[in-house]
């Protein structure tokens, strides 16, 4: 019987963010089918008239793919049979941001789910002691951010202290004219303390910690994507 006679199947997506110039994943899962040839995956983007990607009869079907996605998309073909319709997006562009729809047809039925995809740039900060400075100074550097983030310094000893008066942050446009290098300098640093350089925009939050003692310097950094939700 035809598609119209089938019931709906559950399709699940997860909002995510893509790092400009790198590869990204648009996550989508569905109730699996026993026959690969019965599965159709279509990825669509709001406002884009061609398809983002289509997979049917066990292979890519890209004749109706929109030009903006040419040569940049792939599904995990070997995982489709177990219900993975996630899309790999190569060389993420700023313009890839938007609302995507993961649309699935199987012998059991059809279903779809939307996904919000944000794009920007985010990178781990590295905090170092600036030995060239006249006083004890820390330098926090992160190579690629977009949109322009905020930078806040914190310290373990002086919790809640405002370091804006004793820090200086600059943003330097990178060669591709979109992303920027973030450099923040913290002056009047005291020894036996842990300082944190926190960089944040609406896509990601990254922290670089440095612990400075008489005998050693310890560093740690981590990055977290914001607003990732099912």
């Amino acid at each position: 019987f035809g598609i119209s006679g089938r019931h709906s199947i559950t399709v699940t997506t997860v909002a995510s963010a893509g790092n400009i110039g790198e590869d990204g994943i648009l996550s989508c899962t569905f109730e699996p089918d026993i026959k690969l040839s019965d599965i159709v995956i279509q990825w669509l983007k709001e406002g884009v008239l061609g398809l983002v990607h289509e997979f049917k009869e066990g292979k890519d079907e890209l004749s109706e793919q929109d030009e903006m996605f040419r040569g940049r998309t792939a599904v995990f073909a070997d995982q489709v049979i177990v219900g993975n319709a996630s899309l790999r997006l190569k060389n993420v562009q700023l313009t890839d941001a938007g609302t995507y729809k993961c649309y699935i047809i199987t012998s059991k039925g059809k279903g779809n789910a939307n996904l919000e995809y944000k794009t920007g740039a985010f990178s781990m900060p590295e905090v170092n002691v600036d030995y060239n400075a006249s006083s004890e100074t820390l330098r926090c550097e992160a190579p690629r951010w977009f949109p322009q983030p905020t930078v806040v310094w914190a310290s373990q000893v002086d919790q809640g202290a405002n370091f804006s008066e004793v820090s200086n942050t600059s943003f330097e446009l990178n060669s591709e004219n979109v992303t920027m290098k973030v450099v923040s300098v913290l002056y009047n640093v005291t020894i036996n303390n842990t300082y944190s350089c926190m960089i944040e925009n609406d896509i990601a939050k990254a922290t670089g910690d440095i612990k400075v003692t008489e005998s050693e310097i310890k560093r740690r950094s981590h990055l977290q994507l914001l607003n990732s939700k099912a």
Epitope: G47, L49, G50, S63, E64, E67, R70
Partner: antibody, heavy 116, light 107 residues
């Protein structure tokens, strides 16, 4: 059936502007791009650009950038192509065509003659 | 821009002949090529899309093949109504450029 009907022939003086219309029917107007292609007398086909009827976003051929403007009116399912600062080499038949990666159907064509 | 080089530019043939027109892209365009037929005073008409797919209503004597940079349009047995100009077009990357055309004339 799907149909694209273009406005009538135009005669313009060098330096003037021309605006050609293309009215779509028989399908969801916002579902596919509208392209413009021109053909000078006895010559081949030249891609001019396209418009997304949903968003109004456009892509133009480099050589026409700054002189060509494509717009749309979703209430009447019509797209427009305006070419300014006309010169004699702009004399051509101008076609609109619907599509994503291939063009089908095409309008009947509009002859624009640029002559002093 | 991607260049499309079509050959021959003109061709004389007889009814019943098998005719081949080729098109070469200046870079890999996968299978994003279309073929159109144009008769004098008329708009072009889509024959083949995505390199080898026959447009609805187009006679099966028309076929397309190729992938990457080299493509072919074949008319298996020429009919009187097939004498026209044929154009290839790439739709891999804007601008969607056309070949210069092949004029098919009666011998």
């Amino acid at each position: 059936q799907v149909q694209l009907v273009q406005s009538g022939a135009e005669v313009k003086k060098p330096g003037a502007s021309v605006k050609v219309s293309c009215k779509a029917s028989g399908y969801t107007f916002t579902a596919q791009y509208m392209y413009w292609v021109r053909q000078a007398p006895g010559q081949g086909l030249e891609w001019m650009g396209r418009i997304n009827p949903t968003s109004g976003n456009t892509v133009y051929a480099q050589k026409l950038q700054g002189r060509v403007t494509m717009t749309r009116d979703t209430s009447t399912s019509t797209v427009y192509m305006e070419l300014s600062s006309l010169r004699s080499e702009d004399t051509a038949v101008y076609y609109c065509a619907r599509g994503i990666n291939w063009f089908d159907p095409w309008g009947q064509g509009t002859l624009v003659t640029v002559s002093s | 821009d991607i260049q499309m080089t079509q050959s021959p530019s003109s061709l004389s043939a007889s009814v019943g002949d098998r005719v081949t027109i080729t098109c070469q892209a200046s870079q890999d365009i996968s299978n994003y090529i279309n073929w159109y037929q144009q008769k004098p005073g008329k708009a072009p008409k889509l024959l083949i899309y995505a390199a080898s797919r026959l447009q609805s209503g187009v006679p099966s004597r028309f076929s397309g093949s190729g992938s990457g940079t080299d493509f072919t349009l074949t008319i298996s047995s020429l009919q009187p109504e097939d004498f026209a100009t044929y154009y290839c077009q790439q739709s891999y990357r804007s601008p969607f450029t056309f070949g210069q055309g092949t004029k098919l004339e009666i011998k």
